[in-house]
Interface confidence: medium
């Protein structure tokens, strides 16, 4: 696997790696159209949770926050559907007993922000 | 930092730390509903990047294609507009000179999907 | 691992009330849209009513508009549905679940469902 060096050469000792400090990018930082999460037809709200034992520390959590989708008149519109757009990534787990510091990487889902699409089925009036 | 052991105790030889081998919650998937990329008001396609040396190596992008949001016509309506959701991500590089592999995170910008907004005004003189 | 127990169900005679509680484990139903569903013998499960995710925006199946009411307490992660009027076409066995993609979410998406309470409406 990815994590696993060539089978030619000597195993790993203790199950860990070598992680460079420093992150590459690390300044990158999202640019997204302003307000978009409430100028959205399937407008949400944000949570945010913090870790002081992960990284990023703060991890976004979206949730949309209506079912249907908000019409030209500012109404809700339950013919449509507000729904979840969601990504996987990865986030680092900081171990450490004493001076012994280790890293173990964490995939978490992340609900980004939300998208007005037509439904699957009607079953709600 | 994030990256740094207290300051009692000694230095971390040569820039690197133990990062541990397995990921936590490496099965959870993304589980969102179905095709909502074409039955968006904004609908997105798919780009997939891949590259061996990177965790995961596959990276998919978002592209909106339209500038409009999709009416119930099915016409593009351009007094709405189709906008890019982005999220930062983790990736870890693999970097090797022969049986010597190390580590590195690196910050990417995904474009995860879209969404229909009601657009700026921007007042031209 | 998410946890659903429905309880509050019984009989109950034409026009009667049932205030029908789920508490949920493993899962904090503030952060997801939840919804009620039912199903009588010999019939498939149906959807019932939902609650968003923030607030208490609601939407009802047509055959129990006006007459049954969802909400949810953030605090003891627990969702009810209040049941008026009832019929006995109401009979059936009621299960609550979150409701991942909204109204969008399908009854052959869910993986786990609790027991369910019985609600039985006698003439």
């Known amino acids: 696997t990815f994590f696993q060096k060539p089978e030619s050469c000597p195993p790993v000792p203790g199950g860990s790696m070598k992680l460079d400090i420093g992150i590459i990018n690390e300044n990158q930082r999202v640019s997204m159209s302003r307000n978009i999460e409430s100028r959205s037809t399937s407008p949400w709200d944000y949570t945010v949770t913090w870790d002081p034992n992960r990284y990023p520390s703060e991890v976004v959590q979206a949730q949309c926050r209506n079912l249907g989708c908000i019409n030209a008149q500012g109404k809700e519109d339950i013919s449509m559907n507000s729904v979840p757009i969601q990504q996987e990534t990865l986030v680092v787990r900081r171990k450490h007993q004493g001076c012994s510091v280790s890293f173990q990487l964490e995939k978490v889902l992340v609900t980004v922000g939300c998208t007005c699409v037509t439904p699957v089925i009607h079953h709600v009036q | 930092t994030f990256f740094q052991k207290p300051e009692s105790c000694p230095p971390v030889p040569g820039g690197s730390m133990k990062l541990d081998i397995g990921i936590i919650n490496e099965n959870q998937r993304v589980s969102m509903s179905r095709n909502i990329e074409s039955r968006s008001t904004s609908p997105w396609d798919y780009t997939v990047t891949w590259d061996p040396n990177r965790y995961p190596s596959e990276v998919v992008q978002a592209q909106c294609r339209n500038l409009g949001c999709i009416n119930a016509q099915g016409k593009e309506d351009i007094s709405m507009n189709s906008v890019p959701i982005q999220q930062e991500t983790l990736v870890v590089r693999r970097k090797h000179q022969g049986c010597s592999v190390s580590f590195q995170l690196e910050k990417v910008l995904v474009t995860v999907g879209c969404t229909c907004v009601t657009p700026v005004i921007h007042h031209v003189q | 691992q998410v946890q659903l127990v429905e309880s509050g169900g019984g009989l109950v005679q034409v026009g009667g009330s049932l205030r029908l509680s789920c508490e949920v484990s493993?899962?904090?139903?503030?952060?997801?849209?939840m919804g009620w569903f039912r199903q009588a013998p010999e019939k498939e499960r149906e959807f019932v009513a939902a609650?968003?995710?923030?607030?208490?925006?609601?939407r009802y199946a047509h055959f129990v508009k006006g007459r049954f009411t969802i909400s949810r307490d953030n605090a003891k992660n627990t969702v009810h549905l209040q049941m008026d009027s009832l019929k006995p076409e109401d009979t059936a066995v009621y299960y609550c679940?979150?409701?991942?993609?909204?109204?969008?979410?399908?009854?052959?998406?869910?993986?786990?469902w609790g027991l369910g309470t019985q609600v039985t409406v006698s003439s």
């Open positions: 679940n979150d409701m991942p993609y909204g109204l969008d979410t399908r009854m052959d998406e869910y993986e786990y």
């Open positions: 493993g899962l904090p139903v503030s952060s997801y849209a």
């Open positions: 609650i968003s995710w923030i607030g208490g925006d609601s």
